[in-house]
């Protein structure tokens, strides 16, 4: 099995990842490996010859580049966070700060916007993941509820007037929680909608 | 080469804020990270956070949200880090360091005592 | 937070020996780990970065190797110089974490 440099009459190489074409020479030569880049083109006689990414820097793939690409910070004005540095071998990876949704993508995600309230009785959806999408409102299921706007905040379950010793004054609806009170005591008119204890 | 100055000792009182700087040289300010790491007595390293001093930007631990604040002057290449709400259990070494890799590049570190 | 469990804590050699540290990391970091070299009153320095890459200027006898998530810093023959404190860090991920160190003292 032949080690490169080879000569390749019909412009393939065996190893499309780790050798390229070089159509000068009609040869295939090695793809140089991440965290490299050439800094001696191949010949008929001689292979690439790579060095390492200096700082700052990084090439992600086998790579056939004479320069690595420039570490980028993720832009805090576009409403991203760094999850993880770069290195030699990767990008900065970036993803949507808390309370934000990914709104513009192009290979990855380069724009973020706020995710939208969910109202009272209503709570978002979970996803597999997070800051892939905008907030999608779905109604607190029986027996919960929810009484902000907030895009974040999620269904309680009703209290259980009896586990406190108390009795049942108003039942729970989806936007509101469940009112006790003290089983000796009537209800005033005005205290409803709250626990009284 | 590249340096890293940092400030002097300082000692505080638990609830007072101390803020200690870090003067580069020797590589170009804007474009490295400088990240926080202290060293409390007989405890593990700690990352604290890090600035990009080409915006300015600041990434916490979440351990230390709320009380700790890094910040950075273009105009003479200096880090800082504030921590607010002093208690015992902050002190410690602090150091300012520079990343690539893991940090090849360390300030000489700065000693926090809180003590009443 | 990705922990990194370091082993031993301390151990006792001899001028001349091989010592080998292990470093476990909780989840997955790739090769994003770096090594350091502690003296009493001094910052750390920087041995090895992306797991097996000797820093600048340090001696062959410091090697790593590993991936994932095991991790193991070799000294082939222990110098006098070499009597430290050793860390292991990861930065694959944010917050970089830290092993709780080895102590390598004089049998």
């Known amino acids: 099995q032949a080690v490169p440099p080879y000569a390749s009459e019909n412009q393939t190489c065996r190893d499309q990842e780790k050798e390229y074409y070089e159509p000068q020479h009609r040869i295939c030569c090695s793809r140089c490996p991440p965290g490299t880049y050439v800094s001696a083109k191949c010949s008929r006689i001689r292979d690439t010859v790579c060095a390492t990414c200096a700082e700052n820097s990084y090439n992600e793939h086998w790579n056939y580049l004479t320069i690595c690409q420039l570490c980028r910070p993720c832009d805090p004005v576009m409403g991203l966070e760094e999850i993880a540095p770069c290195t030699s071998k990767r990008k900065t990876q970036c993803r949507c700060q808390p309370g934000m949704f990914c709104a513009a993508w192009a290979l990855e995600c380069t724009h973020c916007e706020l995710l939208s309230d969910c109202p009272p009785g209503t709570e978002a959806e979970l996803k597999d993941e997070v800051g892939k999408g905008n907030n999608h409102c779905v109604p607190c299921k029986a027996g919960h509820f929810q009484n902000t706007s907030s895009p974040s905040a999620r269904c309680q379950p009703h209290t259980r007037c009896e586990n406190q010793g108390l009795v049942e004054a108003a039942p729970g609806t989806a936007q509101s929680d469940t009112t006790c009170k003290n089983p000796l005591e009537p209800l005033p008119p005005e205290m409803s909608g709250t626990m009284l204890m | 080469q590249v340096q890293l100055v940092q400030s002097g000792a300082e000692v505080k009182k638990p609830g007072e804020s101390v803020k200690v700087s870090c003067k580069a040289s020797g590589y170009t300010f804007t474009t490295y990270y400088l990240h926080w790491v202290r060293q409390a007595p007989g405890q593990c390293l700690e990352w604290m956070g890090w600035i990009y001093p080409g915006n300015v930007h600041a990434q916490y631990n979440e351990k230390f949200k709320g009380r700790v604040t890094i910040t950075a002057d273009k105009s003479t290449s200096t880090a800082y880090m504030e921590l607010s709400s002093l208690r015992s259990e902050d002190t410690a070494v602090y150091y300012c360091?520079?990343?690539?890799?893991?940090?090849?590049?360390w300030g000489q570190g700065t000693t926090v005592t809180v003590s009443s | 937070d990705i922990q990194m469990t370091q082993s031993p804590s301390s151990l006792s050699a001899s001028v001349g020996d091989r010592v080998t540290i292990t470093c476990k990391a909780s989840?997955?970091?790739?090769?994003?780990v770096a090594w350091y070299q502690q003296k009493p009153g001094k910052a750390p320095k920087l041995l090895i970065s992306s797991a097996s890459y000797r820093y600048s200027g340090v001696p062959s006898r410091f090697s790593g190797s590993g991936s994932g998530t095991d991790f193991t810093l070799t000294i082939s023959s222990l110098q006098p110089e070499d009597f430290a404190t050793y860390f292991c860090?990861?930065?694959?991920?944010?917050?970089?974490?830290f092993g709780c160190g080895t102590k390598v003292e004089i049998k």
């Open positions: 360091a520079r990343s690539w890799e893991g940090f090849p590049y």
């Open positions: 989840q997955n970091v790739g090769i994003n």
């Open positions: 860090q990861q930065y694959d991920t944010y917050p970089f974490t």
